[in-house]
C-alpha cells in the first residue's frame, strides 16, 4: 500500500479510566494531512462517532474508558498529498492494584510513571494528562500514599503539585486525580506517579555536555532535506531543557506559519551514570535564507551551533 | 566490594567530644548516603543520623543539638561527631550505606561497628 | 517518634520450621518497613527493605508482608545460619526507629 511502518514504543495503561492517544509524528503532520485510526491491522477504521466508546477525535484515539480487552497494537495512517505513514502504538492494558481497604481507597500504581524531586529545593511533580479539546477536566487532587495531601509544603497549580523545602519523606506512591467530561459524561481519571529524592552530589545543579554539534559550518546544496541532531549528555536526574533556536526563537515558533523547519521528538539512551538525549531540527527543504544564520542547539545552559552554507563550487566539472 | 570501617577513640570521658570515622571502599559517597546508628550492650538500635549525597543532613531530634555529621567526598570518608558525652552513650557505634535509591531508605551495608566508653 | 515493637523478645524453633516475627508500629507508616540480622558476632545485614523487597543475595526462604501498621518477617525453613537477633525498622518519618528486637533460637 505504499505507506512507510514507524513503530512507537509500548504504552502501558490502567483499566477503567480514559485515555486517549494523539498521532502526530512532526514534520509529517505539520501540512495537510489526512489522520486514520485503526486496530490491528483492522481494514475498518476506528469509528468517529462521540458516542462510542472507542472513536477518533480528529487526530487522537480517544477511549472512554480504557476497558481489559483494549490491548493490541493500533495504527494510525497519515496521508499527505505525496506521502503516506502508518505509526504502530502498542497499548497493554493492566488491572489496578488497589490500596488496602484499612489504608484507604486509592490505588497504589507503581512505575506509571516516575518523577524525581531535589532535596532541600522548592520542586513539582506534573499530572500528565494529555486529552483531545472535547475533553474538558476539572480540579486536580493529589494523594501520597494513598492519602490525600494536605499541608503548608504542597500546593496545587493547575496540572502541578508544587513542593516547597523537599524532604526525605516526600518520596512515595503519588497519585493525581481529576474528572474529566465528555459529551455529558463524567470519568475519573488517576495517574500513579513513583517519586524518589535525589540530591546533586557536589554544589549546584550539573551542567549538560552538547557532543554534538560542535560550533560548525555544514555544506549543503540548495533545496535538499537535511536533518541534523543534537546529541546531550546529561546527568539522569537533570531537568534541562533540550530544544533548537534561530533568532533566540525556538524554531517551531519562528517557522510557526510554513513549518519548513521543525524540531523533532526527543529520545534519549540511559547508561549507568548519564542520559544520552538526541533532539534533531529538520529542514524540509533548504533555502537562500537560511545559509549564514547560526542554529543553535540549547541545553540547560550550554549551546552549540550549526551554520548552512553552500558547496564550495566544484571547478573540476568545467 | 563494598565495605564499611568504622574508627573511633574506645574511651572518652564524660562531658568530652566523640569524634568517629567511617571510611568506605567500593562506592562513591556523591551516590550514597551514609547513616549512624548505635547500639547499647544487649539492647536494642539508636538511629543517630544520616547525611546525604550532597551536604543535606538528618538527626535524631533527641540528640541533634549536641550532633554533628561530616564527611569528605574524595577521600571517601565520613565524620561523626558527639558532643558532651554521658555514660549512657556507652555503645558500639555503625556506619551504614543507605540504598541510594531516594524512595526506601533502608541500611544495605554495616561496618563491624567501633565500641566506645565513657568513663572517667 | 514512631514507635515500632516487636512483642516477641525470643523464639524458639526447629529447624525445617516456618517462623514468623512480628512488628508494629504505632501509626501508618504505609511500607516503609525493612528487616535487619545481627549474628552474635554483631554483623548487620539487610534482609528486606519496603516491607516485601528481597535484598541481593538474601536467601529465598526469607520474605516480608505487611501494610500500615502490622509487619511481619517469615523464614519458610529454618536453618541452622539463621540463629541471629532480627530488627524491624521504619523510614517513613524522621527519626528513623528500629524494633526492640527477636533472638530465634534452636530447639
Known amino acids: 500500500d505504499g505507506c512507510k511502518d514507524i513503530f512507537m514504543k509500548n504504552e502501558i495503561l490502567s483499566a477503567s479510566q480514559p485515555f486517549a492517544f494523539n498521532c502526530t509524528f512532526p514534520p509529517i503532520t505539520s501540512g495537510e494531512v489526512s489522520v486514520t485510526w485503526y486496530k490491528n491491522s483492522s481494514k475498518i477504521p476506528v469509528s468517529k462517532i462521540i458516542q462510542s466508546r472507542i472513536h477518533q477525535d480528529e487526530t487522537w484515539i480517544l477511549f472512554l474508558p480504557m476497558e481489559w480487552g483494549d490491548s493490541g497494537v493500533y495504527q494510525c495512517v497519515i496521508k499527505g498529498r505525496d506521502s503516506c505513514h502508518r505509526i504502530h502504538v502498542n497499548l497493554t492494558v493492566f488491572e489496578k492494584h488497589w490500596c488496602d481497604t484499612s489504608i484507604g481507597g486509592l490505588p497504589n500504581l507503581s512505575d506509571e510513571y516516575k518523577q524525581i524531586l531535589h532535596l532541600g529545593k522548592d520542586d513539582s511533580l506534573t499530572c500528565h494528562l494529555h486529552f483531545p479539546k472535547s475533553c474538558v477536566l476539572g480540579p486536580i487532587k493529589w494523594y501520597k500514599d494513598c492519602n490525600e495531601i494536605k499541608g503548608e509544603r504542597f500546593t496545587v497549580l493547575e496540572t502541578r503539585l508544587l513542593v516547597s523545602n523537599v524532604s526525605a519523606e516526600d518520596r512515595g506512591n503519588y497519585a493525581c486525580q481529576a474528572i474529566l467530561t465528555h459529551s455529558g459524561k463524567q470519568y475519573e481519571v488517576l495517574n500513579g506517579i513513583t517519586v524518589s529524592i535525589t540530591e546533586r552530589a557536589g554544589y549546584g545543579g550539573s551542567v549538560p555536555k552538547i557532543i554534538y554539534p560542535k560550533n560548525h559550518s555544514i555544506e549543503v546544496q540548495l533545496g535538499t532535506t537535511l536533518i541534523v541532531d543534537c546529541n546531550v549528555t546529561d546527568t539522569k536526574d537533570n531537568t534541562n531543557l533540550r530544544c533548537w533556536r534561530v533568532n533566540n526563537t525556538l524554531v517551531d515558533d519562528y517557522y510557526d506559519e510554513s513549518k519548513r523547519i521543525r524540531e523533532g521528538v526527543e529520545t534519549h539512551v540511559s547508561f549507568r551514570e548519564h542520559n544520552l538525549y538526541t533532539v534533531n531540527i529538520t529542514f524540509l527543504e533548504v533555502k537562500m535564507e537560511d545559509y549564514g544564520l547560526p542554529f543553535m542547539c540549547h541545553a540547560g545552559v550550554s549551546t552549540a551551533y550549526i551554520i548552512l552554507q553552500l558547496p564550495a563550487p566544484d571547478f573540476r566539472a568545467y | 566490594q563494598v565495605q564499611l570501617k568504622e574508627s573511633g577513640p574506645g574511651l572518652v570521658a564524660p562531658s568530652q567530644s566523640l569524634f568517629i570515622t567511617c571510611t568506605v571502599s567500593g562506592f562513591s559517597l556523591s551516590s550514597y548516603e551514609i547513616n549512624w546508628v548505635r547500639q547499647v550492650p544487649g539492647k536494642g538500635l539508636e538511629w543517630l543520623g544520616v547525611?546525604?549525597?550532597?551536604?543535606?543532613?538528618n538527626y535524631n531530634s533527641a540528640l541533634i543539638s549536641r550532633l554533628s555529621i561530616s564527611k569528605d567526598n574524595s577521600k571517601s570518608l565520613v565524620f561523626l561527631k558527639m558532643n558532651s558525652l554521658q555514660t549512657d552513650d556507652t555503645a558500639i557505634y555503625y556506619c551504614?550505606?543507605?540504598?541510594?535509591?531516594?524512595?526506601?531508605?533502608?541500611?544495605?551495608?554495616w561496618g563491624q561497628g567501633t565500641s566506645v566508653t565513657v568513663s572517667s | 517518634d514512631i514507635q515500632m515493637t516487636q512483642t516477641t523478645s525470643s523464639l524458639s524453633a526447629s529447624l525445617g520450621d516456618r517462623v514468623t516475627i512480628s512488628c508494629r508500629a504505632s501509626?501508618?507508616?504505609?511500607?516503609?518497613l525493612n528487616w535487619y540480622q545481627q549474628k552474635p558476632d554483631g554483623t548487620l545485614k539487610l534482609l528486606i527493605y519496603?516491607?516485601?523487597g528481597l535484598h541481593s543475595g538474601v536467601p529465598s526462604r526469607f520474605s516480608g508482608s505487611g501494610s500500615g501498621t502490622d509487619f511481619s518477617l517469615t523464614i519458610s525453613n529454618l536453618e541452622p545460619e539463621d540463629i541471629a537477633t532480627y530488627f524491624c525498622q521504619q523510614d517513613s518519618k524522621f527519626p528513623w526507629t528500629f524494633g526492640g528486637d527477636t533472638k530465634l533460637e534452636i530447639k
Open positions: 519496603y516491607t516485601s
Open positions: 501509626q501508618d507508616i504505609y511500607k516503609y
Open positions: 551504614a550505606r543507605g540504598t541510594g535509591t531516594g524512595f526506601y531508605y533502608a541500611m544495605d551495608y
Open positions: 547525611i546525604w549525597t550532597g551536604i543535606t543532613t
